[in-house]
Amino acid sequence: IHPSGVTGLVPSLGDREKRDSLCPQGKYVHSKNNSICCTKCHKGTYLVSDCPSPGRDTVCRECEKGTFTASQNYLRQCLSCKTCRKEMSQVEISPCQADKDTVCGCKENQFQRYLSETHFQCVDCSPCFNGTVTIPCKETQNTVCNCHAGFFLRESECVPCSHCKKNEECMKLCLPPPLANVTNPQDSGTA
């Protein structure tokens, strides 16, 4: 393989996989000599310089404050720690350490509503007013409510059927229950 130099932050995934496959697990291909396999740096550290020859140590250094690496690596720089987003009402569950990223979450009685693949807003769990709790609120899912008669579920809240407009989906939920099939005595006789 043509060595990619590994001077940037992260080599492309394809390059990395190809380079890694030339060496046993826990080792990587020397950036300038692809006949040498060097030991990867432990999590919490990053690569300063490749091993000078087989069997000699790779030079690794601990990640500085505000940075981390969560697995064995040969990164030239640690990754920046995540910051919990106050404007999304997130709270820090555990701080960033050299070997693990910050963990962000929500306060009690809140759930994570994802606005995108990786960003979530902390939102109060629905209390199910005018209904009963079917499934309690979870980390990433709002309470599931079962609404009382005369109410329908709209975005996790029980809304009065008077708020249901014609032709809306809620019409089905707000129909009065069918009357019991009572036979009329006048209909039961014979002609």
Epitope: R85, L115, S116, E117, T118, H119, E155
Partner: nanobody
Framework: EVQLLESGGGLVQPGGSLRLSCAAS????????MHWVRQAPGKGLEWVST????????YYADSVKGRFTISRDNSKNTLYLQMNSLRAEDTAVYYC????????????WGQGTLVTVSS
């Protein structure tokens, strides 16, 4: 290529109103969540609001809830942000975004529109 062009910013007094627009092109606008983010002078990017593809679901940061309204017109490929009861702390460059993760993970390169709230 995704193109987003923000407009409508300007100088406004505290308590005043502004309506921002974002003209989108280069992607199927009606299929995507859309977002407003802002960057106050000397600060990082801050999420403001999100709207679902149909426009039926809207989400707001606590700091703007009840004052700002996000909306969209899918027939015009345009996103809006109606800003009422503006405060000095709303002063920022406002950006619309189609990919929130990308925008909040990097320094944003969009042009944005500057909103200045001052008496």
């Amino acid at each position: 290529e995704v193109q987003l062009l923000e407009s409508g910013g300007g100088l406004v007094q505290p308590g005043g109103s502004l309506r921002l627009s974002c003209a989108a092109s280069g992607f199927t606008f009606r299929k995507y969540d859309m977002h407003w983010v802002r960057q106050a002078p000397g600060k990082g990017l801050e999420w403001v609001s999100t709207i679902s593809p149909s426009g039926r679901r809207t989400y707001y940061a606590d700091s703007v809830k009840g004052r700002f309204t996000i909306s969209r017109d899918n027939s015009k490929n345009t996103l809006y942000l109606q800003m009422n009861s503006l405060r000095a702390e709303d002063t920022a460059v406002y950006y619309c975004a189609e990919n929130l993760d990308q925008v909040l993970s990097f320094d944003y390169w969009g042009q944005g529109t500057l909103v200045t709230v001052s008496s």
